[in-house]
């Protein structure tokens, strides 16, 4: 399981209309459920239940975003509408270029994502936990535009990281 180097750029607008960018780095793991590829796009937080909706119109998600899903404790969702892998698949079907799962509260999901699939997704499925997950969710929960860049080798230039 290779390390996924995730670079998140946050766009902070000022009243004058200018914006400042803040870049932060974190690491996750590429799961066997998806491809070990670089990917990028705007971060879109998705609730696990939001991926249950199979309404055709809802499936017309735009192309080119990175889905972030915080998985809940299994006890809170004893009969999920989809497996974790199914949720990743649904996000990619809706146009995600990559999916990042925060597995901090559901570490069992790691095994589910790493079970050798005969038909892995063609897009990366990454999981994060611990301090990296906290860092990611802190960014996602801000009312700010954010983009993620996922790479399977460290970014070439040392990025100036800002504590989010």
């Amino acid at each position: 399981k290779e390390t996924a180097f995730v670079e998140v750029v946050l766009f902070e607008s000022s009243p004058s209309g200018d914006y400042t960018t803040y870049t932060t780095g974190l690491t996750g793991r590429f799961s066997r459920a998806g491809a070990t590829l670089s990917a990028e796009g705007e971060i879109v937080q998705m609730h696990p239940l939001g991926l249950c909706n199979n309404n055709d119109e809802e499936d017309l998600y735009e192309y080119g975003w990175v889905g972030v899903v915080k998985l809940e404790q299994p006890e809170l969702d004893p009969k999920p509408c989809l497996t974790v892998l199914g949720k990743a698949k649904r996000a990619v079907q809706r146009g995600a270029t990559a999916v990042i799962f925060d597995v901090s509260e559901n570490p069992e999901a790691i095994d589910q994502l790493n079970q050798g699939s005969e038909d892995p997704l063609k897009r990366p499925v990454v999981y994060v936990k611990g301090a990296d997950a906290i860092k990611l969710m802190n960014i996602v929960n801000k009312q700010k535009v954010a983009r993620a860049r996922i790479q399977h080798r460290p970014p070439r230039q040392p990025t100036e990281y800002f504590d989010m």
Partner: antibody, heavy 117, light 110 residues
Framework: EVQLVESGGGLVQPGKSLRLSCSAS????????LHWIRQAPGKGLDWLGY???????VYGDAVKGRVTISRDNAKNTLYLQLNSLKSEDTAIYYC???????????WGQGTLVTVSS | DIVLTQSPALAVSLGQRVTISCKAS??????????MHWYQQKPGQKPKLLIF???NLASGIPARFSGSGSGTDFTLTIDPVETDDIATYYC?????????FGSGSRLEIT
């Protein structure tokens, strides 16, 4: 069916402010990013700004400092507030759906704003 | 800002092949994602997405339209051209803020 309907256009005097609305239906509004784009008569397309699904905003250069984009997820509506209007702001104003890293997949029909004394 | 340069007007005969170019002032490729898109706008109508991410045909668009290119050079091809294609064609990038459009290429039939 995805629908975006802009309203609030019309004749406005220079120096005044205006607020345009974009009413959305046919999709879960709070899940999507939305943009404002304008087109002056006989001219090209000009991106004004973006509101992300979590209400983050980024603005374009054309109206920087005079514009505020906001959204009301409960009302399925996106807003554009434009201050200190000039004659150069005369244009058709469109809202369009798409994340900042996605194409503009759906467009409203536009609302015409004419700035003139 | 990323500037997109398009040729302003093109004249073509019906049934012919036409290519419309768009040159970006900076690389607009991303990791596993294309940041260049094409739109068609007919007189008095709203723009319509034709091609997304450089080469993907948008839903409901005829296969006469195709897109290609990478980096800074992109092309929209219509083959064969039909009367219904009389319109202005815009390229657009969203690699970086501010998002920008080309100035448009007007297609005329000779």
């Amino acid at each position: 069916e995805v629908q975006l309907v802009e309203s609030g256009g019309g004749l406005v005097q220079p120096g005044k402010s205006l607020r345009l609305s974009c009413s959305a239906s046919g999709f879960t509004f709070s899940n999507y990013g939305l943009h404002w784009i304008r087109q002056a008569p006989g001219k090209g397309l000009d991106w004004l700004g973006y509101s992300s699904s979590n209400s983050g905003t980024v603005y374009g250069d054309a109206v920087k400092g005079r514009v505020t984009i906001s959204r009301d997820n409960a009302k399925n509506t996106l807003y554009l507030q434009l201050n200190s209007l000039k004659s150069e702001d005369t244009a058709i104003y469109y809202c369009a759906r798409g994340y900042s890293s996605s194409p503009f997949a759906y467009w409203g029909q536009g609302t015409l704003v004419t700035v003139s004394s | 800002d990323i500037v997109l340069t398009q040729s302003p007007a093109l004249a073509v005969s019906l049934g012919q092949r036409v290519t419309i170019s768009c040159k970006a002032s900076q690389n607009v490729d991303g990791f596993g994602i294309g940041y260049m898109h094409w739109y068609q706008q007919k007189p008095g109508q709203k723009p319509k997405l034709l091609i997304f991410a450089g080469s993907n045909l948008a839903s409901g668009i005829p296969a006469r339209f195709s897109g290609s290119g990478s980096g800074t050079d992109f092309t929209l091809t219509i083959d064969p051209v039909e009367t219904d294609d009389i319109a202005t064609y815009y390229c657009q990038q969203n690699k970086d803020f501010p998002l920008t459009f080309g100035s448009g290429s007007r297609l005329e039939i000779t």
